[in-house]
């Protein structure tokens, strides 16, 4: 019988609202087993594979996709999706990242610790279908 | 307990062909596993050749220099084949079959015994 | 096509001490690659999986890292039992399962 594949979570850290010129770590989370985590912006267009998978526990393995200095063109929502071999997953539900102003005015949101989006019941719209091969662009482990 | 056994290893002549089986016991291919090719030429390394995905999809990968001259078929829930055409002395080697699992990320945590195929007129 | 090259082709060391073996990918495998041991007339044994997870039962005398496209895999230790062959091979579906040259151990 063939797998059928969990959707992947997505969760940022230290949270989805950064202060321009900080750090933000894009954590995405699959089965055991899984090659390739793609992290992808709204569009689909813009997207980044890395092949730096880890096992985060007995049965979940995971990646982290780095971005060194938040700027506003940053600001956005995105979501994961994985390649196991021989399949793509589903995507994930859509993370909102905020980038906010350094001044920190009396109004300014605090950074939300551990954001994620996990799976959810919703079907599948069996988009990943158009995904390329793991094979291809597999190069860059940042963002941007 | 889990194994597996190639089988068909033999003398064949030069632009002969051979087919190897490898038999499940203890578990079936039906489960989600790659199933792999290895050979060993004597005293030298190891040489990957391709893998079968179990599954109801059956994909198949292939090493370059293998494809078109060897196919890789699963040809029941506890056998998976390797046929092999156009054979020459470079082909004589220890044949394995292996078992990838994603609990191990597709590393081969269970291996035959191997069969020898020898290659000469 | 991807290619993992051995270091060194074959080595000795003393029971008690500790060996370190490496393998370069020529390309970006990420963490997909395992190492086994072989001894003569036996086929491979997985002992690290994923660059740097011990496969079940095996000693944690045995461990893999990575840094970029080199991996190393480190046994300390050493028991007369370790002598055998050891190989990598990536685990990469887009780049091959592709097995390294190999290295010799021997115990002394």
């Known amino acids: 019988q063939e797998e059928d594949l969990p959707r992947p979570s997505i969760s940022a850290e230290p949270g989805t609202v950064i202060p321009l010129g900080s750090h933000v770590t894009f954590v995405c989370r699959g089965p055991v087993g899984v090659q390739t985590f793609r992290l992808e912006r709204e569009s689909r267009s813009t997207y980044n594979d890395t092949e730096d998978v880890s096992q985060a526990s007995p049965s979940e393995s995971e990646a982290r996709f780095r971005i060194d200095s938040v700027s506003e063109g940053n600001a956005g929502p995105y979501r994961c999706i994985y390649y196991k071999p021989p399949k793509w997953s589903e995507q994930s539900d859509y993370l909102e990242l905020l980038v906010k102003e350094t001044s920190g005015g009396p109004d300014s949101p605090d950074t939300e610790p551990g954001s994620s989006a996990g799976p959810t019941q919703r079907p599948s719209d069996n988009s990943h279908n158009e995904h390329a091969p793991a094979s291809q662009g597999l190069k860059a482990e940042h963002l941007y | 307990e889990q194994s597996l056994e190639e089988s068909g290893g033999d003398l064949v002549k030069p632009e002969g062909s051979l087919t190897l089986t490898c038999t499940a016991s203890?578990?079936?291919?039906?489960?989600?596993?790659?199933i792999c090719w290895v050979r060993q030429t004597p005293g030298k390394g190891l040489e990957w050749i391709g893998c079968?995905?179990?599954?109801?999809?059956?994909?198949t990968y292939y090493a370059s220099w293998a494809k078109g001259r060897f196919t890789i078929s699963k040809t029941s829930s506890t056998t998976v084949t390797l046929q092999m055409t156009s054979l020459t002395a470079a082909d004589t080697a220890t044949y394995f079959c292996a078992r990838g699992a994603d609990y191990v990320y597709w590393s081969y945590g269970l291996w035959g015994p191997g069969t020898l195929v020898t290659i000469s007129s | 096509e991807l290619v993992l090259t051995q270091t060194p082709a074959s080595v000795s060391a003393a029971v008690g001490g500790t060996l370190t073996i490496k393998c370069q990918a020529s390309?970006?495998?990420?963490?997909?690659l395992a190492w086994y041991q072989q001894k003569p007339g036996q086929p491979p044994k997985l002992l690290i999986y994923?660059?740097?997870y011990l496969a079940s039962g095996v000693s944690s005398r045995f461990k893999g890292s990575r840094s970029g496209t080199e991996f190393t895999l480190t046994i300390s230790d050493l028991d007369c039992d370790d002598a055998a062959t050891y190989y990598c091979q990536s685990t990469h579906f887009g780049n091959g399962h592709t097995f390294g040259g190999g290295t010799e151990v021997v115990v002394k």
């Open positions: 079968i995905y179990s599954g109801s999809s059956g994909d």
């Open positions: 203890g578990f079936s291919f039906n489960s989600n596993y790659w």
């Open positions: 390309e970006t495998i990420g963490t997909n």
């Open positions: 994923l660059a740097s």
